[in-house]
């Protein structure tokens, strides 16, 4: 599976979501949904 990486928000490692404090704007990608700040 692809690993999603962003300036802030979260990353996916081994299909586990790891959250960070900063919000991610939807201008950085598509909103994944049903999570916090997740875009891709």
């Amino acid at each position: 599976d692809a690993e999603f990486r962003h300036d802030s928000g979260y990353e996916v490692h081994h299909q586990k979501l790891v959250f960070f404090a900063e919000d991610v704007g939807s201008n950085k990608g598509a909103i994944i949904g049903l999570m916090v700040g997740g875009v891709v």
Partner: antibody
């Protein structure tokens, strides 16, 4: 208003492939991932994966790895889900869906009407 | 993968009475004080509809009689006063990890 409109019912032979489309309207296509969920007759819901219209990146349920491909066409605001090597157990209604994130102050979901795929010899 | 287990499989409740559905996750679906647990209602021939997200928050336009509770691995959906239009199948779902997974569903009927 937000709409997800799916392609029509399909009947396929075992071993064949099917490609279901989901055309989005009423919002900026690239701002939301599109998820695919299927439901076999009389059974529960099964998440298949999602694709990002923004980046083209997809994430698939490992159960379908190697058999499912999700793509998008930004020129027509359409997402596609292709499932190959079909077997009878793939007979199901296939839904596309869009969800808000928890941090947006409101959370709505939008679903396509569903596409029945029947796999039969 | 996280496995979601619902109980009971079916439930018959009198109109105006309370209906309670349980959902258990094989591991915690909490992260940073948020429970990534959602509830859906599905009526025959229709797609699912999101009722409750983040364990306790009502989806847009969802009647107040629907409420959710729980954290960690154990969650509950409550319909405080069952109405005829609530006859449906209800599913829990976790969105903490990929692959997202659903419970097997609970069919709610009128007694």
């Amino acid at each position: 208003q937000v709409q997800l409109v799916q392609s029509g019912a399909e009947v396929k032979k075992p071993g064949a492939s099917v490609k279901v489309s989901c055309k989005a309207s009423g919002y900026t296509f690239t701002t939301y991932a599109i998820h695919w969920v299927r439901q076999a007759p009389g059974q529960g819901l099964e998440w298949m994966g999602f694709t990002s219209p923004y980046s083209g990146v997809s994430n698939y349920n490992q159960k379908f790895k190697g058999r499912v491909t999700m793509t998008r066409d930004t020129s027509t605001s359409t997402v596609y889900m292709e499932l190959s090597s079909l077997r009878s157990e793939d007979t199901a209604v296939y839904y596309c869906a869009r969800f808000d994130n928890f941090d947006r102050g409101y959370v709505r979901d939008y679903w396509g009407q569903g596409t029945l795929v029947t796999v039969s010899s | 993968d996280i496995v979601m287990t619902q109980s009971p499989d079916s439930l018959a409740v009198s109109l105006g009475e309370r209906a309670t559905i349980n959902c258990r996750a094989s591991e915690s679906v909490d992260n940073d004080r948020i429970s990534f647990l959602n509830w859906y209602q599905q009526k025959p021939g229709q797609p699912p509809k999101l009722l409750i997200y983040a364990a306790t928050k009502q989806g847009t336009g969802v009647p107040d009689r629907f409420s959710g509770s729980g954290s960690g691995t154990d969650f509950t959906l409550t319909i405080s006063s069952l109405q005829a239009e609530d006859v449906a199948v209800y599913y829990c779902q976790q969105s903490k990890e990929f692959p997202w997974s659903f419970g097997g569903g609970t069919k709610v009927e009128i007694k």
